[in-house]
Amino acid sequence: LKGQEFAPSHQQVYAPLRADGDKPRAHLTVVRQTPTQHFKNQFPALHWEHELGLAFTKNRMNYTNKFLLIPESGDYFIYSQVTFRGMTSECSEIRQAGRPNKPDSITVVITKVTDSYPEPTQLLMGTKSVCEVGSNWFQPIYLGAMFSLQEGDKLMVNVSDISLVDYTKEDKTFFGAFLL
Amino acid sequence: LKGQEFAPSHQQVYAPLRADGDKPRAHLTVVRQTPTQHFKNQFPALHWEHELGLAFTKNRMNYTNKFLLIPESGDYFIYSQVTFRGMTSECSEIRQAGRPNKPDSITVVITKVTDSYPEPTQLLMGTKSVCEVGSNWFQPIYLGAMFSLQEGDKLMVNVSDISLVDYTKEDKTFFGAFLL
Amino acid sequence: LKGQEFAPSHQQVYAPLRADGDKPRAHLTVVRQTPTQHFKNQFPALHWEHELGLAFTKNRMNYTNKFLLIPESGDYFIYSQVTFRGMTSECSEIRQAGRPNKPDSITVVITKVTDSYPEPTQLLMGTKSVCEVGSNWFQPIYLGAMFSLQEGDKLMVNVSDISLVDYTKEDKTFFGAFLL
C-alpha cells in the first residue's frame, strides 16, 4: 500500500490493516504464591496480578487461572522475567560430603497449552545452575521471543521451585505478551 | 477494517491507523559516565549516546539529560542491558572476617518519571547477588517489557553502582524503547 | 491519520501503511553444531533450524548459511538466547596454581554483515565470566534490541565457544528478528 493512489471512482478492498491500539496485549506482575496442588511431573505454574499497579490486559487478551488466553491468531512477542532468591544452595554441602556434585538449579519455562494437543509445548526455557558461595543469593532469569499462536492457545509460566520466587515487587517478576 | 469494502459514494471515518515508520523509537548506547550529583535514596541514572554509532532517536522520541521523553501516549516496549564488571566482591572477605554475610549485588532499574507524580515508578528491576570466586568478574543484566505510557512521561536507567558499568562498547550496555 | 475524514471527491495519497501480517519475521532454533571452518579472529557463528518445530521464516525473511537475510529496510527487533553448559571452569585451578586469575568467560554476539562494509558490525553482546564452584554448570545469555537495518543486511549469532552451546532443546537456544 506504500504511497499508492486510490481513485474514488470504484470500490476498494483493503488489506487487513488494523489500529495498533486494538491489538491483544498483556503485562502481568507477580503476586505471592500460596501453597496449591500442581500437576504431577510438571513444574508448578505461577499465578499473576492482571489489573493492579503496572499490570493490565487489553483487547480481548484475558488472564484466567494462571493462563493468558490468546484471543486471535498471529505472531506474538512473549516475555517473562522471574527473580529467584534463596539461601546457600546445597551444592557445597553435597561436594563436602563427597557425593557427586549435582548443582542446584533454577528454571523458568514459558509453556503453550493447545486444547487439541495432549501435551503442552515448551516455547522458552531459561535454566541456570546455582552454586552460590554467599548465604543469600538472588538473580533473575529473563526470556523473550516471537511465536505464531492460534486463537484459543493458553500461555503460562512454570518454575522449578515456586518457593524461591521473589514476589515482593511487581518490577522483579513479570510475564507479558503482545500481538505484533 | 479486515477485508472490508468501502464504497466511494460517502465519506469514511478511518480508525487511527498509522505508518509504522512514523512511530517514536530510540536505541541509546553507553558512554563513559562522568561523576555527577545523584538524588538521595535513589540509584544514580546513566547518561547515554543518542546519535552516534548504533544509537538513534526518531519520530519525536527525544533524549535529554539522562531521560527518554515519551512524545505520545500508548503501549511501549522498553528494554535495557547493563554489563557490569568488577573485582572480587567483598562477599568472601566478609564471610572470612566473621561479619554477617550480606552478598554484594548489582541492580538495574528502569524508572518512569511523571511530572504530576511526586515519586518515580520503578517499571523493571534486575538484581543479582555477586559473590564471585574469581578476581575479575563481568556479567550483563537484561530487562525488557511492555508498559502503557503517557505523553510527557520520562524514562531513565538507574544502577546500583555506576562505577561498575562497562562503558567500553556500545553493544554491551544499551537502553531503548519503541511504540507498539 | 487519526480519525480523519476523507471525502471521496478527489484522489487520496496514502501513507505507507501495511498489514502487520506481511512483515518479515523469523524465529530460529538451535541445532547440533557440526565442526566447520571459522573466520580467523572472529567467534564462530551458529547455524540454525529455520522450519521445523517452533522455527519459522516468513514474508521474504530468509535463512541461509548461518545468516538471516534482511529483505526490507526498516527498524527490526532482534533477539537471541544461547544456553551454555560446561564442566568446572579452570578458574579455580588457575588461581591455585598461583598464576594470574583470569576468569573463563562465555560470550554471545549478534553481528550484522553489510556487503558494502569491509567489517562486520557487532550489534549486541552478552558476556559473562564463569567461575563456578560446582562441577557442572549451565546458564543462558539473553540479548534483544532494536536496530535500523538495510535491505540486504545479514545477521548472525557468534559465540565464544561453540562446544559449550546447549543444542538439546529448541526452547533453550534461539535467534529471531522481526520488522517493527
Epitope: 500460596t34 501453597p35 508448578p44 539461601m87 546445597e90 518457593s163 515482593t168 515487587k169 | 550480606k102 | -
Partner: antibody, heavy 118, light 107 residues
C-alpha cells in the same frame, strides 16, 4: 484446603529426644518448604529451621544446629522434626508451617506441646 | 543474626481506634518483612507480606508500610476480633527472626 496436622503432645525427660510429625494435605507437598517454629509458654516465636521436601535440603538456626534434624517422607506427605538432648527450657509448643515462599509462613499446624520435666 | 524489635510491647485501645505498631530491623532487610496475628492458645495467622502486601482473605483495615529497617503495621479501625498479639518477622536472611510481639488489648 491446605492443612497441616501435627502429632499429639509429648512429655519427655531431660536428655531424651522427641520427634514431632506434621502431615500435610491440600497442596503439592514437595513444592513448598516446611518450617518449624517454637513458642515457650508466655514467650514469643522462635524459628528453628526449614526443610525442602523436594531435595531433602535443610537450613537450621545456629542455636539448634547440633541438636535438631528435620526430615520428610514424600510418600505420605509428612515432615518430621527431631530434637535431641532435651532440656527443661525446650518446653514449648512446636509448630510446623508451610510457606508459599521459603521466607514466610502461610499456613500453620495446630501446634504440639512438648513438656520436658524430670 | 538480624535482631527485630517492636514497639510498643503492649497497648490498650478501643473498638474503632486507629492502631499503629512499629517494627525495626538491626540491618536493612529491603521489603522482606511479614506480619502475623496470634490469639491465645492458637497458631499465628499470616497477615502481611513484602512489608505492605495484604495476604489473601485479610481485611483491608490492615495495612503495612516501610522498607529497609523501619516498618509499620496499621489497623485503621480496630474491630473486636483484632485484639491479639502481633509479630513482625524478617525473611531476608537465615536465621529468620521474629520481633518480641505487641499485645493489643481492650482499653
Amino acid at each position: 484446603q491446605v492443612q497441616l496436622v501435627q502429632s499429639e503432645a509429648e512429655v519427655k525427660k531431660p536428655g531424651a529426644s522427641v520427634k514431632v510429625s506434621c502431615k500435610a494435605s491440600g497442596y503439592t507437598f514437595t513444592a513448598y518448604y516446611i518450617h518449624w517454629v517454637r513458642q515457650a509458654p508466655g514467650q514469643g516465636l522462635e524459628w528453628m529451621g526449614w526443610i525442602n521436601p523436594n531435595s531433602g535440603g535443610t537450613n537450621y538456626a545456629q542455636k539448634f544446629q547440633d541438636r535438631v534434624t528435620m526430615t520428610g517422607d514424600t510418600s505420605i506427605s509428612t515432615a518430621y522434626m527431631e530434637l535431641r538432648r532435651l532440656r527443661s527450657d525446650d518446653t514449648a509448643v512446636y509448630y510446623c508451617a508451610v510457606g508459599g515462599s521459603y521466607d514466610a509462613f502461610d499456613i500453620w499446624g495446630q501446634g504440639t506441646m512438648v513438656t520436658v520435666s524430670s | 543474626d538480624i535482631q527485630m524489635t517492636q514497639s510498643p510491647s503492649s497497648l490498650s485501645a478501643s473498638v474503632g481506634d486507629r492502631v499503629t505498631i512499629t517494627c525495626r530491623a538491626s540491618q536493612s532487610i529491603s521489603s522482606y518483612l511479614n506480619w502475623y496475628q496470634q490469639k491465645p492458645g492458637k497458631a499465628p495467622k499470616f497477615l502481611i507480606y513484602g512489608a505492605s502486601r495484604l495476604q489473601s482473605g485479610v481485611p483491608s483495615r490492615f495495612s503495612g508500610s516501610g522498607s529497609g529497617t523501619d516498618f509499620t503495621l496499621t489497623i485503621s479501625s480496630l474491630q473486636p476480633e483484632d485484639f491479639a498479639t502481633y509479630y513482625c518477622q524478617q525473611g531476608y536472611s537465615s536465621p529468620f527472626t521474629f520481633g518480641p510481639g505487641t499485645k493489643v488489648d481492650i482499653k
